[in-house]
């Protein structure tokens, strides 16, 4: 058993049929010695008397809010949550496996630039009695500060018969150094509590590996006189790190015909303009990636050719 | 470069960008491969890193690029020695067309561009002997190449910025 926060305790249980459970001793936080009784949750049933209460915690029915009383008045509370371990593996019932970029990916994180700011998100099908808290640091043995905001419900989607909820959090490294080479990874830890079930999820990454620029902006097409060719230009996204002479992007451009089956030639360039043949009904697209480190490509920015 | 002269920024830019390409072709990104799953994330913590105080940021380069260039050169020599060591020459054998050979030569080429003959900056202690098991050696190659990718990315940014803003 360990204390999650004041008056909230997590009991770690090996979860298998007929498991013996965990013996827990609760102590009433009071100078009083006599006439103390204990109850669980709203039930008025007295579980025991005395300053301490010893219980065997085996299942969710044994978890909940234990209260010690004297003379009809509550003296202190202890909320017991359960953290299940099945076959040596902590349970992951609350969050959905996003399976990208690999199996057992419950938290996904992205950064738009090297400023030390990043967003993490996760998915669940649970809609009620659910709370999350997030902690983050750079490195684990001698952690450096990362400040995370409040967790927000960022999207709701219908998937077949189920509703899926996306939660996200934004974090910022306290003393970010955008130009340096990261040596220690960022650690993100999410505590999830659903009713009386406690779970924790972690992710470890370097900012450089989760970079995904915003799409290029200001796509413009300028037809060239007496030619089927078009001069296309675009700009770095506003959210990308500066100066661009240092934090450079590379671009992938393509012209996509109306039919998705049509062959599309992709051209890679470090410039912010190109000359292409842009047929009627086709569209021109461009995406960006860090020029020197193969992190994710941005989403496509597109503009119709006509 | 030693003693305050300027490097051939444009040449360094070209060669450092080539290094980035080679480092990624030697060890392509595969989303589901997470080296930390194999434990011992400290393995490559003794390689040189370009850190916050090394003056490799745009402002530091403007003030005095020498600190940063010295740091980059130390790192290039360190990695060049690693790629020529038993970690890469021992079992398992590299594929005949492995990019590691080119990568090794390019690291040497860039370090020499930063220090013409006759000048010698002190270099960092070269790493200890490689592990005995082929799988351990392969794991170490992965870690070294991932670490090299991060190092040469910063070096390439430095030279790109230098070529654009500090060239005479």
């Amino acid at each position: 058993i360990w204390e999650l926060k004041k008056d909230v305790y997590v009991v770690e249980l090996d979860w298998y049929p007929d498991a013996p459970g965990e013996m827990v001793v609760l102590t009433c936080d009071t100078p009083e010695e006599d006439g103390i009784t204990w109850t669980l949750d709203q039930s008025g049933e007295v579980l025991g008397s005395g300053k301490t209460l010893t219980i065997q915690v085996k299942e969710f029915g044994d978890a909940g809010q234990y209260t010690c009383h004297k003379g009809g008045e509550a003296l202190s509370h202890s909320l017991l949550l359960l953290h299940k371990k099945e076959d040596g593996i902590w349970s992951t019932d609350v969050l959905k496996d996003q399976k990208e970029p690999k199996n057992k990916t419950f938290l996904r994180c992205e950064a738009k630039n090297y400023s030390g700011r990043f967003t993490c998100w996760w998915l669940t099908t649970i809609s009620t009695d659910l709370t999350f808290s997030v902690k983050s640091s750079r490195g684990s043995s001698n952690p450096q500060g990362v400040t995370c905001g409040a967790v927000t419900l960022s999207a709701e989607r219908v998937r077949g018969d189920n509703k899926e909820y996306e939660y996200s959090v934004e974090c910022q490294e306290d003393s970010a150094c955008p130009a340096a080479e990261e040596r220690l990874p960022i650690e993100v830890m999410v505590d999830a509590i659903h009713k009386l079930k406690y779970e924790n999820y972690t992710s470890s990454f370097f900012i450089r590996d989760i970079i995904k620029p915003d799409p290029p902006k200001n796509l413009q097409l300028k037809p060239l006189k007496n030619s089927r060719q078009v001069e296309v230009s675009w700009e770095y996204p506003d959210t990308w790190s500066t100066p661009h002479s240092y934090f450079s992007l590379t671009f992938c451009i393509q012209v996509q015909g109306k039919s998705k089956r049509e062959k599309k030639d992709r051209i890679f360039t470090d410039k912010t303009s190109a000359t292409v043949i842009c047929r009627k009904n086709a569209s021109f697209s461009v995406q960006a990636q860090d020029r020197y480190y193969s992190s994710s490509w941005s989403e496509w920015a597109s503009v119709p050719c006509s | 470069v030693p003693g305050g002269s300027s490097p051939a920024w444009a040449q360094c830019q070209q060669l450092s960008q080539k290094l980035c390409t080679l480092a990624w072709s030697a060890h392509p990104l595969v989303g589901h491969m997470d080296l930390r799953e194999e434990g011992d994330e400290e393995t490559t913590n003794d390689v040189p890193h370009i850190q916050c105080g090394d003056g490799c940021d745009p402002q530091g380069l403007r003030d005095n690029s020498q600190f940063c260039l010295q740091r980059i050169r130390q790192g290039l020599i360190f990695y060049e020695k690693l790629l020529g060591s038993d970690i890469f020459t021992g079992e398992p054998s590299l594929l005949p067309d492995s990019p590691v050979g080119q990568l090794h030569a390019s690291l040497l080429g860039l370090s020499q561009l930063l220090q013409p003959e006759g000048h010698h900056w002190e270099t960092q202690q070269i790493p200890s002997p490689s592990p005995s098991q082929p799988w351990q050696r392969l794991l170490l190659r992965f870690k070294i190449l991932r670490s090299l990718q991060a190092f040469v990315a910063v070096a390439a940014r430095v030279f790109a910025h230098g070529a654009a803003t500090l060239s005479p």
């Epitope: - | 060890h27 491969m33 194999e38 398992p92 392969l138 190449l145």
Partner: nanobody
Framework: EVQLVESGGGLVQAGGSLRLSCVAS????????MGWFRQAPGKEREFVAA?????????HYGDSVKGRFTISADNGKNTVYLQMNSLKPEDTAVYYC??????????????????RGQGTQVTVSS
């Protein structure tokens, strides 16, 4: 799910040659490492050879086949080959093609894998 299908096994005289092929169903081929194991009746599984494209790309052979067997691949065809020359009776076994996509070859060199084919029988008569 990666599926691996081996072919090319058969009966051969000692000193002869065989070429085994293994086709991988998925296009995870070049991000995996591919290899061959063998198992003779009543014996432990034995590592034969592996090829991978990470860490600079690598090839590795088990001690008992070094200099006689050659592993190669055709990435365009998602196929890995095992050329077996100077075959000996002790090379008789079921030969399995294996893929290591999670650890890109480290598992193969440690003697395990993510996926394995059904196997093809190689019999070397004296």
């Amino acid at each position: 799910e990666v599926q691996l299908v081996e072919s090319g096994g058969g009966l051969v005289q000692a000193g002869g040659s065989l070429r085994l092929s293994c086709v991988a169903s998925e296009r995870t081929f070049s991000s995996s490492a591919m290899g061959w194991f063998r198992q003779a009746p009543g014996k432990e599984r034995e590592f034969v050879a592996a090829i991978g494209w990470s860490g600079g790309g690598f090839i590795h052979y088990g001690d008992s086949v070094k200099g006689r067997f050659t592993i190669s691949a055709d990435n365009g065809k998602n196929t890995v080959y095992l050329q077996m020359n100077s075959l000996k009776p002790e090379d008789t076994a079921v030969y399995y093609c294996a893929a290591d996509s999670r650890l890109r070859g480290i598992a193969l060199l440690k003697g395990s894998y993510d996926y394995r084919g059904q196997g093809t029988q190689v019999t070397v008569s004296s």
